[in-house]
Each structure stands twice: as structure tokens, then as C-alpha cells.
């Protein structure tokens, strides 16, 4: 309330016709008065308040806040809700008026020609066809076409309401193109306007461009881009392409629906963009956009257009690569080119083919690099159109962590006689060569625990390696300057430790370090006063030969000589482990049967090995007991058995052409065990030495001086042993005329 007036509660406007529903006949006059407590307004069906001349709203003559609505000659289309409301609030009064027009029982829509009904193919959804009635209790059915189908209200999901229209599950009419309502009055049929059925889907799942990326062309070539769009069912799509050159004459666009499998929940569309002869101005981003009205999805690709075919290496192409033995090496080819070049790899000038260890292509991959992979790798790119070639060399250096040569042998655990001078060597191979080799030592007696040796763990509890400069309590040491030697075709570094007098049993370790790793070798230096071992014969035996091991001890000092052979676990030295002293590891020794005899001052225990095999290799230990102290002394000898190898001739004899009077020198290099006997033949006759024919070096080298015509012929070198023979042949041609000598 305001202005001091008493507060008045606001009531809704009052209509002169106090009914919710009013039914009147067509062509009569509708007049309703509305009274209220403040400014009023009327709303009527179709809301044509501004343009409808037939509807008249006038102020009442007898009171304020009163308006009368008059429609002369009402029609069926005037059926609907008439609402009187206060302008400044939501308060209103409504009456629903049916204008019964039996000639036009359905109210025509505003747009008049036809309506649109949107539906989705969902079993649970209903749709309302808004065929409102001017008569409330009509018998209305729904007609759908094509094919023609009629639906009648069933009191459940299909119904008609004069104020709302015809309600039906949407899937029932999803097949139809159009629907309309039909009413029967006195055997006459009346139809509503037609409603077009639009089945709505709008979801776009994805937009896929093909080729997807990295398309490259040269001027004049044809570009074809396919844009495939997957959507839900009942989707309509607009395609749009965005491209760099808008003024292209040869652009062609084709859009079509793609067939999908029956029962598929998806629809596919394809738009194809074709440019017949691309120019440089066609280079750039191409975007395909698919639009359904309620969704847009896009995808883009960059098209590169080159002036002409070309090939070049990209920046960042390496010139040298370093790797460590065992690494996987990847050398990628970085190139620019169109079309993509053919790629060929060469190593030291030889083509490389892919196999299980090396893969070639855009990337050269060496699965597990080894030293033999060191070298120069050349990659040659060839443009398939212009045949232009580009090459690039990559130098591969394979680094090798230090490897100590002696380590690959069974660790030599020979004993060393007291007081003698001994040299211990470490031959190191490493790439790059080691930047240092250092020697360390510790006492052999350093808390050795046999139980730990059995468990294959380090049996030494003291881990303090001392530098050999600090030889307090040990042997006097001198480390020779490193020497460099070419061994087996490899540059190796040899470090020698000289023990000036072998007084104390000790462990020595050499350690080599380079930039990619370290290697070490532990040498057990076991000093003994007592027994000595000799080998009869004194060379290394070959399989199937016989050998005797003699253990000689001074009989006034020692007694109880026994031979043992160390078992395999005594030899197992794992990387970085300290070797177990054989003499202390009794669990690993096997007693051997041997024969004793004396020669005055010494006892000799002879271990005879007949017909030796590779299994007889290993460490042989002779024990002798001190007569006074009863302390056991031991001495170890490592026996290596050479494998029997059939004769082989390395290298070939070359055919030669010589002039009379010259000298021929040929060499026949053999290998095999036992070493083979070499025999030479000329024209299958044994070659006999004379003044002009000299055989040297166990017949390895043949020299023919002052060659004569009769020296021409087929020469054969034959190497034979008990295991067979090998031979090589060469033909010597002698040119020129034989001159008579003075002597003749």
C-alpha cells in the first residue's frame, strides 16, 4: 500500500462468463467482459493481437480497470484460451472457448500450409501432432503416409486431446513422410493440415581425413582429399571445406552418403575434394567441417606443394655416433624431399641388408652393437622421379669397456716358489684405451671363510684393497710402465707388476678404467716353500696324448705327498669376485691315484694321465706335509689340453707367371693339432730339394732360384697329420727362351 490508503488484497480479474470452458457455434458473436483492480490486457488464440482486425477490445463505460473483448462471426480457428491479465503481474483469468464449426473441426495453424513434427526413434518417446479441435469430443484418428496407416486412440499411449492434439509413440510414425488428423462427423471426414515428419538425429561422432597428414605434392599433380564423417542415425549433414586458394578453377567437391551394414547404429558420409593440377598457392591447411545444426566437427591436414621433385638431408643429421658394446644403436635419417626418397645404407662401401641383427630403412638400427660394427655408414637418398641422389656418411665408433685378456682364461692359480721374482700381467683391451691401469693388493690370509666359498659368495671378509705403493707387510713391488702391443689384430695395453721377491701369499688386483666402464682382474698369488710340479713331456698335451705330472719334494722336509684335482666350482670366478685359493678350498678337490718313487734326496709323486681329453684340463694340486710342523703345503699347476684339429691351410697359393732366370718364393701356412707335416709336389711327383729348389721352415716356404723352363707345372702343398690331409695347388708358368749356359 502507498499514499496512506488502507492495504487492499489483490484478486485475479473476474470474467463475465464464469466458466472454465465455453462452447459456442460458429458465426455467433463472442463477448467477454473482464474487471479487475488495476490495468488489464487480453490475450487470445494465435496471439494476433496487433494485426487481427476482427477482434475488438474496448474500455467498459461503467467502471475503471474493465475491458470487453468482442469477436463478431466467430470461426473454428477462434477456438482456444482467452486470457485476461494484469499488465504488471502474473495474475490472470482464463476461459477456453470452443467455436463449434462442423465444416472445420480442426484449428488451422498460424503458418497454415503445413506443420513440422520432429521425432526421435526412441521407443520411450511420444510425440504430439498439434491438431487442436474446435469441438471437444471428436472421434479423431491419425493418418500416416506412405504407406498409408491409420492410428486410433487406445486409451493408453495413443490419445487425442482437443487442447493439445494427437499423442502417439514416436517410433510408430518414424517411417512416415507426413501425418494428419482426421475427424468423422455425420459420416463426413474432415482433415487437419499436413504435418511433415522430421526424424531428428544430430550427433557427429568423428571426422576423418584421408590421407590423414603429411600430404606432399609437386606442382601440377592432383590432390584428392576424402573426408569421412560418422554420425548417429537420421542425421543430415552440411559439408564445408576451408582451403588456402579460394580462386581455384579445378576444385571439385562431391558429397555422398556411404552404405553401412544393415542394423548399424551409425551413418557415414563422404565428401571428396579434388584439385586436378595443384599450384604453389594451394599449399596450406585444408579443413573439412561437418555440421548437423546442433553439432559441428572439423579435422584439418596440411598440404605441402613443392615446385619440383627434390631430396636433401635435414639439419641435425649426425656425422658421428658413439655407442658402447651391447647398446641398441639407432641412426635416424632426417631428410626433406618429395616424393619420399628411396633409402639405401652402405657400410664401408658395401650395401647393408636387413637381418635379425640389423634393420635398415628410415632408421638404421643395430640391435646389439659389437666392435665389428665400427665403421663408416653411408646413407644414399634417391628421388624416385628425378633420380637425384644425396649421400651422407656417419662414422660409428663402438666403445668397449676395459676387458682384461687373462680373465677369459681359467683364472691361473699356480703357486709361486718362495723368494723368486715374478711378473703378473694384465693385458687390457678397451676403446678408447684405458686412461689408467692401477694395481692393488691384500693379504691372501685375509679372514678366509670356506663356508662362504661353498655359497659362491665372496669368501674374503676384508675388502680393503691397498695401493701397491703401500707394500708394508707384503711383497716388494714395482709396476712397469704400460706397454702397447698389437695382439690378435687389436691394440692392447699391457701392464706388468713385478714382484721382486715372492715372500708372502697375497691377492693382486689390476683395475682398468676408460670413459665407458671399468674392468678388473684378481690374481691369487700363492707363495710356497716346498714341492715343485713338472710336466713330462714339458709341452702342452694334445687330446689323446699322454702326460705325466711330477710332484717333487725334499724328503728331509716333506712327507705324505698326495695329488688332487680341483672340481669345477673351484674355477668359477664371477665378475668382480676374488678367486678362492685352491689349496684352502678342500671341498672342491678330488683325490687322484698316483705312483711314488724316490731318487736319493727327493720323493716324486707321479700322476699319469693317459689318452687325455678336454675334460682333463684344470688345476692339479700336490699336497706335502712338513715333517716337523705337520703344516700342509700345496702347489698348483694348471693343465691345458689342446684340442685335436685337422690340418688346414690358411690362404691360397696364387698362380704365377715368371720369366726364366727369376726367383719364385711361395709360402704354405698351415694349422692343426698335432702340427701337420708339409710335403710339396710338382705335377703330382714329390718335390726334392736340389741346388735350385730350397724348402725351409718345416717345408712351409718353397724357393725356386734361377727358374728354368722345366720348373713350369702344377705345384701342390699338402699338409697331413693323423687327422687327415689338406692341400692347395697353383700353376707356375715360365716365360722366355732357354739360353744355353757356358757350363753346358
Amino acid at each position: 500500500a502507498s499514499g496512506g490508503l488502507p492495504s487492499v488484497s489483490l484478486h485475479p480479474p473476474r470474467l463475465s462468463i464464469q466458466k472454465d470452458i465455453l462452447t459456442i457455434m460458429a458465426n455467433t458473436t463472442l463477448q467477454i467482459t473482464c474487471r479487475g483492480q488495476r490495468d488489464l490486457d487480453w490475450l487470445w488464440p494465435n496471439n494476433q493481437s496487433g494485426s487481427e482486425k476482427r477482434v475488438e477490445v474496448t474500455e467498459c463505460s461503467d467502471s475503471f480497470f474493465c475491458k470487453m473483448l468482442t469477436i463478431p462471426k466467430v470461426m473454428g480457428n477462434d477456438t482456444g484460451a482467452y486470457k485476461c491479465f494484469y499488465r504488471d503481474t502474473d495474475m490472470a483469468s482464463v476461459i477456453y472457448v470452443y467455436v463449434q464449426d462442423y465444416r472445420s473441426p480442426f484449428i488451422a495453424s498460424v503458418s497454415d500450409q503445413h506443420g513440422v513434427v520432429y521425432i526421435t526413434e526412441n521407443k520411450n518417446k511420444t510425440v504430439v501432432i498439434p491438431c487442436l479441435g474446435s469441438i471437444s469430443n471428436l472421434n479423431v484418428s491419425l493418418c500416416a503416409r506412405y504407406p498409408e496407416k491409420r492410428f486410433v486412440p487406445d486409451g493408453n499411449r495413443i490419445s487425442w486431446d482437443s487442447k493439445k492434439g494427437f499423442t502417439i509413440p514416436s517410433y510408430m510414425i518414424s517411417y512416415a513422410g507426413m501425418v494428419f488428423c482426421e475427424a468423422k462427423i455425420n459420416d463426413e471426414s474432415y482433415q487437419s493440415i499436413m504435418y511433415i515428419v522430421v526424424v531428428v538425429g544430430y550427433k557427429i561422432y568423428d571426422v576423418i581425413l584421408s590421407p590423414p597428414h603429411g600430404v606432399e605434392l609437386s606442382v601440377g599433380e592432383r590432390l584428392v582429399l576424402n573426408c569421412t564423417v560418422r554420425t548417429e542415425l537420421n542425421v543430415g549433414l552440411d559439408f564445408n571445406w576451408e582451403y588456402p586458394s579460394l580462386k581455384h578453377q579445378h576444385k571439385k567437391l562431391v558429397n555422398r552418403d556411404l552404405k553401412t551394414q544393415s542394423g548399424s547404429e551409425m551413418k557415414k558420409f563422404l565428401s571428396t575434394l579434388t584439385i586436378d593440377g595443384v599450384t604453389r598457392s594451394d599449399q596450406g591447411w585444408y579443413t573439412c567441417a561437418a555440421s548437423s545444426g546442433l553439432m559441428t566437427k572439423r579435422n584439418s591436414t596440411f598440404i605441402r606443394v613443392h615446385e619440383k621433385p627434390f631430396v636433401a638431408f635435414g639439419s641435425g643429421m649426425e656425422s658421428s655416433v658413439e655407442a658402447t658394446v651391447g647398446d641398441r644403436v639407432r641412426i635416424p635419417v632426417k631428410y626433406l624431399g618429395y616424393p619420399p626418397p628411396e633409402i639405401k645404407w652402405y657400410k664401408n662401401g658395401r650395401p647393408i641388408e636387413s637381418n635379425h641383427t640389423i634393420k635398415v630403412g628410415h632408421v638404421l638400427t643395430i640391435m646389439e652393437v659389437s666392435e665389428k660394427d665400427t665403421g663408416n655408414y653411408t646413407v644414399i637418398l634417391t628421388n624416385p622421379i628425378s633420380k637425384e641422389k644425396q649421400s651422407h656418411v656417419i662414422s660409428l665408433v663402438v666403445n668397449v669397456p676395459p676387458q682384461i685378456g687373462e680373465k677369459s682364461l681359467i683364472s691361473p692359480v699356480d703357486s709361486y716358489q718362495y723368494g723368486t721374482t715374478q711378473s703378473l700381467t694384465c693385458t687390457v683391451y678397451a676403446v678408447p684405451p684405458p686412461h689408467h691401469i692401477r694395481w692393488y693388493w691384500q693379504l691372501e690370509e685375509c679372514a678366509y671363510k670356506p663356508a662362504q666359498a661353498v655359497l659362491m659368495t665372496n669368501p674374503y671378509t676384508c675388502k680393503e684393497w691397498r695401493n701397491v705403493d703401500d707394500f708394508q707387510g707384503g711383497n716388494k713391488i714395482e709396476v712397469n710402465k704400460n706397454q702397447f702391443a698389437l695382439i690378435e689384430g687389436k691394440n692392447k695395453t699391457v701392464s706388468t707388476l713385478v714382484i721382486q721377491a715372492a715372500n708372502v701369499s697375497a691377492l693382486y688386483k689390476c683395475e682398468a678404467v676408460n670413459k665407458v666402464g671399468r674392468g678388473e682382474r684378481v690374481i691369487s698369488f700363492h707363495v710356497i716353500r716346498g714341492p715343485e710340479i713338472t710336466l713330462q713331456p714339458d709341452t702342452q698335451p694334445t687330446e689323446q696324448e699322454s702326460v705325466s705330472l711330477w710332484c717333487t719334494a725334499d724328503r728331509t722336509t716333506f712327507e705324505n705327498l698326495t695329488w688332487y684335482k680341483s672340481g669345477p666350482q673351484a674355477l668359477a670366478v664371477h665378475a668382480g669376485e676374488v678367486p678362492t685359493p685352491v689349496c684352502k678350498n678342500l671341498d672342491a678337490l678330488w683325490r687322484m691315484n698316483a705312483t711314488t718313487f724316490s731318487n736319493g734326496t727327493s720323493d716324486i709323486l707321479i700322476l699319469e694321465l693317459q689318452n687325455v681329453s678336454l675334460q682333463d684340463q684344470g688345476d692339479y694340486v700336490c699336497f706335502a706335509q712338513d715333517r716337523k710342523t705337520k703344516k700342509r703345503h700345496c702347489v698348483v699347476r694348471q693343465l691345458t689340453v689342446l684340442e685335436r684339429v685337422a690340418p688346414m691351410i690358411t690362404g691360397n697359393l696364387e698362380n704365377q707367371t715368371t720369366s726364366i732366370g727369376e726367383t719364385i718364393e711361395v709360402s704354405c701356412t698351415t694349422s692343426g693339432n698335432p702340427p701337420p707335416q708339409i710335403t710339396w709336389f710338382k705335377d703330382n711327383e714329390t718335390l726334392v730339394e736340389d741346388s735350385g729348389i730350397i724348402l725351409k721352415d718345416g717345408n712351409r716356404n718353397l724357393t725356386i732360384r734361377r727358374v728354368r723352363k722345366e720348373d713350369e707345372g702344377l705345384y701342390t702343398c699338402q699338409a697331413c697329420s693323423v687327422l687327415g690331409c689338406a692341400k692347395v695347388e697353383a700353376f707356375f708358368i715360365v716365360e722366355g727362351a732357354q739360353e744355353k749356359t757356358n757350363l753346358e
Epitope: 576451408e242 546442433l294 553439432m295 559441428t296
Partner: antibody, heavy 116, light 107 residues
């Protein structure tokens, strides 16, 4: 900068007409579906109408069907909503929006008041 | 049409709080759900689409989850600029429909 600038709102009597415009810039307008959403004072959002990029597919909410017409002019980068037979319940702020996976760019909105 | 129901209709929270808003669809909509933020007098702003995909430029403190009928928008640590009304919208079936909104205001 990607943006949508709206114009054309105002006061109109019930049964009257109004045309809303939405000018797009900063993106390729002709590639996107566009739509209109409205918001009655103090109420939530209501989708009104949508149009595909080349105007082939057009949709309306039941509440405006037959009275509103959506259209676009790709040459002018513009979207329109022609509103006829306006009712009091059409009073709202009308927003145009660009359609991608969702309605990602919106105009600033324009108020339409339907009152006598 | 698919009805979208948001709860709560309003929530009072402080800066740094974790805020969770839920949205329920009247039938399954898979993951076709979008979240918008609207500040007074401003247009809505897209936050999350397809239930959990963060729109570019939206801070990572906003996250969405859910599938089928029940969905959640979470603000892990509320910032002063996050006080606004949040709407969910389904994009599964025609016509697109919005939830009634959830107003997040200062406690």
C-alpha cells in the same frame, strides 16, 4: 579473436515482431552450425533454434515453432532470428552460440521484452 | 524430451573448498553431457563436454565424471572467480535440454 556480437533486442508488444542479429568474427563462420538459446529473467537456459552450416538443416523448439525463423548469411558472417507473434512468455535474454562438440562460443546476449 | 535435474539448487562455500554438483538425466545419455558456467549479466561459458573433456583454457581444478544418468561436476579448490551458476546440458537426443542450474555463492 573469436567472437559473436549480438544486436536487435528491445521492447515489443504481444503479437509484435523483432529480428535479432549475430555477427561472427575470428573464425570460419560458414563451417559451423549456429543456434539460439534464451534465458527468461531469473530462470534457466532454454534452447530455441539451430541451423547447419549451409542452412540445409534447421530445428526449432516446440515453444517457438511456426512463429520464429532462423537464418544465416555466410557471405556476411551473420546469423539471424526472426521472431513473429511474440508472447509475454518470450521475454528473455537471447544468446547466439557457435556449435562444436558443445556450444563453445556465446554472444553477449540481447534482451527481448514482450509487454503491452 | 529428456529432463535434466540438478542438485543442489544452490550451495554456499568458501575459497579453497571442494565443491561437487550433480546432474541427473531422466534416461540414459551415455556420456553426452556438457557443463556451463554463467556469471550474473554474462553469457554462459563452456567448461566440460562429453562428461569429462575439459574445454581448452578452463583451469584444471574443474573436472567432470559420470555416464548414463548420473553426472558430477567437481571444483577441487574453489577460487573467488568460481562463484557463479552452473548448468548441465544433455546432447544425447533432440531437443537439447538444460538443467535448472546450481548457484555457488560465498558462505
Amino acid at each position: 579473436e573469436v567472437q559473436l556480437v549480438q544486436s536487435g533486442g528491445g521492447l515489443v508488444k504481444p503479437g509484435g515482431s523483432l529480428r535479432l542479429s549475430c555477427a561472427a568474427s575470428g573464425f570460419t563462420f560458414s563451417s559451423y552450425s549456429m543456434l539460439w538459446v534464451r534465458q527468461a529473467p531469473g530462470k534457466g537456459l532454454e534452447w530455441v533454434s539451430a541451423i547447419s552450416s549451409s542452412s540445409s538443416y534447421i530445428y526449432y523448439a516446440d515453444s517457438v515453432k511456426g512463429r520464429f525463423t532462423i537464418s544465416r548469411d555466410n557471405a556476411k558472417n551473420s546469423l539471424y532470428l526472426q521472431m513473429n507473434s511474440l508472447r509475454a512468455e518470450d521475454t528473455a535474454v537471447y544468446y547466439c552460440a557457435r556449435v562444436t562438440d558443445a556450444f563453445d562460443i556465446w554472444g553477449q546476449g540481447t534482451l527481448v521484452t514482450v509487454s503491452s | 524430451d529428456i529432463q535434466m535435474t540438478q542438485s543442489p539448487s544452490s550451495v554456499s562455500a568458501s575459497v579453497g573448498d571442494r565443491v561437487t554438483i550433480t546432474c541427473r538425466a531422466s534416461r540414459g545419455i551415455d556420456n553426452w553431457l556438457t557443463w556451463y558456467q554463467q556469471k550474473p549479466g554474462k553469457a554462459p561459458k563452456l567448461l566440460i563436454y562429453e562428461a569429462s573433456s575439459l574445454q581448452s583454457g578452463v583451469p584444471s581444478r574443474f573436472s567432470g565424471s559420470g555416464s548414463g544418468t548420473d553426472f558430477t561436476l567437481t571444483i577441487s579448490s574453489l577460487q573467488p572467480e568460481d562463484f557463479a551458476t552452473y548448468y548441465c546440458q544433455q546432447a544425447k537426443a533432440f531437443p537439447p535440454t538444460f538443467g535448472g542450474g546450481t548457484k555457488v555463492d560465498i558462505k
